[in-house]
Structure formats: C-alpha cells, structure tokens
Amino acid sequence: EVEKTACPSGKKAREIDESLIFYKKWELEACVDAALLATQMDRVNAIPFTYEQLDVLKHKLDELYPQGYPESVIQHLGYLFLKMSPEDIRKWNVTSLETLKALLEVNKGHEMSPQVATLIDRFVKGRGQLDKDTLDTLTAFYPGYLCSLSPEELSSVPPSSIWAVRPQDLDTCDPRQLDVLYPKARLAFQNMNGSEYFVKIQSFLGGAPTEDLKALSQQNVSMDLATFMKLRTDAVLPLTVAEVQKLLGPHVEGLKAEERHRPVRDWILRQRQDDLDTLGLGLQG
C-alpha cells in the first residue's frame, strides 16, 4: 500500500504522458487522478512504465472502481491486464468481443494463464453460449481451447459454431468430448455434398457411431490411417473387412503397420481369417 502524500507543486498530471515515467511511485499515487487515468487508459500502453509503476496505476483504478472496472477501461488495459488477478477479473462484465480480443492479444504466445481462463469464463457465461465468433477468436489464440472444456460445457456449443473449428483445435480432445461435438458437427455440415462433408466432419469422427462409419464407407471417402486410429473402438469393431476396405480406400495398406495398436488390433481379432486375407497384408486374426 502506497501511503497518502500530497502532490509536489507543479507535478499534478494534466494528462497521461511520457513525463510520468520519471515519477516515483508515491508521486504517481499523489499526482495522477484516477478518473483521468480511466479516461486515458489507451495511452498507458504507449508509455514504458516499470512494473512497480503499473502496480500504482492498478491500485488507483481499484480504488476508483471497487466493484469492478467498466468495459471502457477494461478494453484499454493492455499490459496492465497482466497485473490483474482472477479475483479482480471475476468482478468484470465483459460483453464486447473487441475487448476480449484486446486482452487476449496481451497474453498472446503464452500458455493460458488463470487470468485469461477467468476472463474467457466470464465472457462466455455473459453471452450464454459459445457462439461462432467467440469460438473463432478463442481458437485463434488458443488452438487447444475447445478440448479444455468439459463435455458439459461443450454441450452449450451451438451447431452453428462448429464451422469455426479447425482440425488442430481438436487434437487434444478425448473421446468423451468428441462424443458431444460429433452430433453437433453432423448437424452443422448436413447440407454439404459427400466429399466436402467428409473433409469437414473428419476431425470429429472420434465421436462417430458405427452406423455413420458404415454410411461413410459407401461414399468413397478414403479415410486416412491417422483418422481411423482415433475412431471409437466400439464403433469400429462391428465393421466388416469390406466396409473397412471401402472406408479407407488406398489407406487400407496402412493397417499392417498398425496391427498391434487399437482399434486395429481389436478389430482384426473380430474378423474371419478368410476375410482378412482379402486385404493382401498378411494380417492374422
């Protein structure tokens, strides 16, 4: 806590500018008006304040807004955002996507911090659902964001938002998460034609049931081995050799290298040897 001291004569800040970097902490506390700071927050980022000086500026804002900062201030926090605690952020009401983007930009290139996680949580809860624009923004900054959500949280994602999801956004999702996302993706892409549909749905197929895999096998899709290996074992097991051959197309040649790994291993054990022999790969059931 910086103790209250009178501002020296002639040092009262008329605006937020570079001259303030020469102020001691107590001078900033005494000579910078919190209301002035709040209206000129956009200037703070252009001035090379020390971390100690930023602490003083944060303290002034905290005093001015004990119930939480208004969005007009939040949007211009810039590097001051890094000084905020999750407790501070829980007091905020962030509704503008532009504000969210501005704050995520500050943390860009770093892991998702507790502050950012809290900010995102507040923003999404405020919106009521994870809409497409929000998801687009969040996955651009944090490709693993979607897979950090619980199946319950994912259930609030509307099918229309699925259009914003890129394959890499699903890399770390587990089967339970894909079980939630797959039906939404199926609904979102239902009006696309065969080959375009497969390109879009491919990343979500770890949540697909057997019936859908059987249907895909009739569409000449040529699923690659990496995708096949991520399918649910229980969904793969009922597929016949002919269906797997049609589903994979030229990629079926890759089954040999994966014969000891799930789901291929379990699937092989379910097949008749005569059927496996038709694949020409020496697979042993």
Epitope: P250, T278, L279, G280
Partner: antibody, heavy 121, light 107 residues
C-alpha cells in the same frame, strides 16, 4: 531370399500398349501389395500405383489413371502393369517394388531389376 | 498429393568431404521418409527408412535426420563408391512420392 524378376525390354510404337510382368518369389505373394515405379531417361523416380495381390484391387497415380491397368496372377505370383496409348514420353525403365510395412504405409525394400520400354516410331 | 522438394539437384565434392542433401515435404509427414541410392543401370537401393534408421549392411557414414517437413541426408565422409543419384521417398501417404534426386559426383 526375396526376388522380383521382371520381363525383358520392349520397343513399341506410339499409340500401342505394353505389358510388363514382375514375378515374385521368396515370400508370400498375397501378403504384400505390389507397386510400380517408372524412371524416364535422366529423370527421377515416379510412383505409378499399386495393387492388392489378394483381391486384385488397384490404386493408381492420378497422372496414369486413364491409361494404366495393374493386374495379378496369384497362381504364378506374378504382377502385371499395362500402359496403353503409348507416347514418346513413356520411354522409361519400369520397376516393380515391394513395400515393407514397418511404419505408416511402408517403404520399398525390394525392387525388380527394371524393364526398359522404348516408344519410338 | 504430397510434394517432395529435394536439393541440390547435383553436387560435386571431394573424397572425404561431408555431403548433405535436403528434402522438404509440402506437408507434415512425421518421420516417414526413406532414402535410396541409385547407380546407373541399377534399381534403387534402400539406405535409410523412418528418417534415420540405417538398413542392415549400409555403412555408418550414411545418416538421416529431421521430422515434420524438413529432412536431411548426410554422407559424413564421401567415398568413391558413393558416386550415385540419391532420392528421398515419403510414405506418410499411400500415394508415395519421391524427391527429384541429387546426383553426387567426385571433384
């Protein structure tokens, strides 16, 4: 010992077809797909396609799809590659190659000695 | 299809020199690359698979490294019998593709 023995050199006229054979021995023919690769004079290697010897199902490089036919005769452990509508650019050495499925889709560990096909009027 | 860009297309080096050839894939191929040596009038001979695994009987002066899209093949000390053309092959996709080749000559 694994061996892939190909048929002899061929000289063909433009517009004709050529059929190259590749007889396999030393392994179970139906346990490995057979691939075909060609090499034009002074040029690099070009993958043409492959065939499942068990069910005769081929997959072709898009570039050759309209002109190539790959077949097998399981009884003699022989794979065939026929190329039709020959043109001078098809003058090349044609190789059959067997993959080893140690990882992913497999790399070629055994090759035939190559068959030279010359297309000339 | 995955394109494999190999460079240089030819090189000339002295016996004992270290020779380096690179292959760049148009997309991520993990470590699924093999290297072949081809001498005139002969079929290609497999030297290395899975980026760096040496085939039995291949001299240890041959080595490979890389992952993703960028790969390197090295001859640590060039020998007269190494005069040949070298090719990379990607097998991360069933539709295999080769690099354009590098012709290695002795100065």
């Amino acid at each position: 010992e694994v061996q892939l023995v190909q048929s002899g050199a061929e000289v063909k006229k433009p517009g004709a077809s050529v059929k190259v054979s590749c007889k396999a021995s030393g392994y179970t023919f139906t346990n490995y797909w057979m691939h075909w690769v060609r090499q034009a004079p002074g040029q690099g290697l070009e993958w043409m396609g492959n065939i499942n010897p068990s069910n005769g199902g081929p997959y072709y490089n898009e570039r050759f799809r309209s002109r190539v036919t790959m077949t097998v005769d399981k009884s003699t452990s022989t794979a065939y590659m026929e190329l039709s509508s020959l043109r001078s650019e098809d003058t090349a050495v044609y190789y059959c190659a067997r993959p080893y499925y140690g990882s992913s889709y497999g790399y070629f560990d055994y090759w035939g000695q190559g068959t030279t096909v010359t297309v000339s009027s | 299809d995955i394109q494999m860009t190999q460079s240089p297309s030819s090189l000339s080096a002295s016996v004992g020199d270290r020779v380096t050839i690179t292959c760049k894939a148009s997309q991520d191929i993990n470590k699924y690359i093999a290297w072949y040596q081809q001498k005139p009038g002969k079929a290609p001979k497999l030297l290395i698979h899975y980026t760096s695994e040496l085939q039995p009987g291949v001299p240890s002066r041959f080595s490979g490294s890389g992952s993703g899209t960028d790969f390197t093949f090295t001859i640590s000390s060039l020998q007269p019998e190494d005069i040949a053309t070298y090719y990379c092959l990607q097998y991360a996709n069933p539709l295999r593709t080769f690099g354009g080749g590098t012709k290695v000559e002795i100065k």
